[in-house]
């Protein structure tokens, strides 16, 4: 069995502001089992954008059905976005742990650009 | 507060079909998974169905093709088609809200399915 | 018969604690979680993702894993702690949700 594989296809993605934007994400395999997140930037200062396990993120919304029971697709919609969205998106697998979940593989990134409105 | 209730249980004969229902309330029922587990007298847990929000469905060997299980998100209702019943599907029959990975964080009371001539 | 396994029952006296062990999904691909059930009632989740416990559970039940088993620890353990409680699993290669047998736990 082939370790599991983080892939985000898009390298970059350009957005006008106030638009939707889709950050695409799939897992190549369903083990081991543990949560996926959505983080804006990389680091200790990295910003949570989206957890499936638990949160209220408002402006997200997921493509597929995550409450499938083999789903591998973790891909995001962002609502409304301005230009204080741009920056790179990471889809990071966790693998499940005790008493936290441990970060186990991360996708290559994808940079969010936002074109302003024309005035 | 989820509140989760079934019903819809009762006296079937052997062969003879039932369907039960889970009324649901409390929660967003559109965007949880959902299961049925059933507990035959004074014995342990079996998971039954499950589904996912989307209708995506899951079964247990014990009933695979035989149960049915679905929802309808505009009456937040869970069902369970149950045929070809025999005498070893007399159980009390419980929905369970499924939490994002699949254990059951919310259980109703029950509806007792009894299978008899 | 049960994928899981856990002991059919553990005596313990109030103030003591008890440990009940379940075992026989692969760490990787399951979750684990621990139900109570009292005589005529719904079982209640007291125990999720293997270690993790609801709003409302008290803090003397506490889950723990080591490789394929998990452990549910009751500690000072009281009398309305007497219940069957269950193991549950989640495992993700068969996407099915396996049960162990239940343990009755008494308080003597």
């Known amino acids: 069995e082939e370790e599991l594989q983080v892939i985000q296809p898009d390298k970059s993605v350009l957005v006008a502001a106030g638009e939707t934007a889709t950050l695409r994400c799939t897992a190549t395999s369903l083990i081991p089992v543990g949560p996926i997140q959505w983080f804006r930037g990389a680091g200790p200062g990295r910003e949570l954008i989206y957890n499936q396990k638990e949160g209220h993120f408002p402006r997200v919304t997921t493509v597929s059905d995550l409450t499938k029971r083999n789903n591998m697709d973790f891909s995001i919609r962002i609502g409304n976005i301005t230009p204080a969205d741009a920056g790179t998106y990471y889809c990071v697998k966790f693998r499940k742990g005790s008493p936290d979940d441990v970060e186990f593989k991360s996708g290559a990134g994808t940079e969010l650009s936002v074109r302003a409105k024309p005035s | 507060e989820v509140q989760l209730v079934e019903s819809g249980g009762g006296v079937v004969q052997p062969g003879g079909s039932l369907r039960l229902s889970c009324a649901a309330s409390?929660?967003?029922?559109?965007?949880?998974?959902m299961s049925w587990v059933r507990q035959a007298p004074g014995k342990g847990l079996e998971w039954v169905a499950g589904?996912?929000?989307?209708?995506?469905?899951y079964y247990g060997d014990s009933v695979k093709g035989r149960f049915t299980i679905s929802r309808d998100n505009s009456k937040n209702t869970l069902y369970l088609q149950m045929n070809s019943l025999t005498a070893e599907d007399t159980a009390v029959y419980y929905c369970?809200?499924?939490?994002?990975?699949?254990?059951?964080?919310?259980w109703g009371q029950g509806t007792l399915v009894t299978v008899s001539s | 018969s049960y994928e899981l396994t856990q002991p059919p029952s553990v005596s313990v006296s109030p103030g003591q604690t008890a440990r009940i062990t379940c075992s026989g999904g692969?760490?990787?691909?399951?979750?684990y979680a621990w139900y109570q059930q009292k005589p005529g009632q719904a079982p209640v989740l007291v125990i999720y993702s293997d270690s993790k416990r609801p709003s409302g559970i008290p803090e003397r039940f506490s889950g723990s894993s080591s490789g394929t088993t998990v452990t549910l620890t009751i500690s000072g353990v009281q009398a309305e702690d007497e219940a069957d409680y269950y193991c549950?699993?989640?495992?993700?290669?068969?996407?099915?949700?396996?049960f162990g047998g239940g343990t009755k736990l008494t308080v003597l």
């Open positions: 369970a809200r499924e939490t994002w990975n699949h254990l059951f964080d919310y």
């Open positions: 409390g929660f967003t029922f559109s965007s949880n998974a």
């Open positions: 589904i996912s929000s989307g209708s995506d469905t």
């Open positions: 549950g699993g989640y495992d993700q290669s068969s996407y099915t949700n396996p």
């Open positions: 692969a760490y990787s691909s399951y979750y």
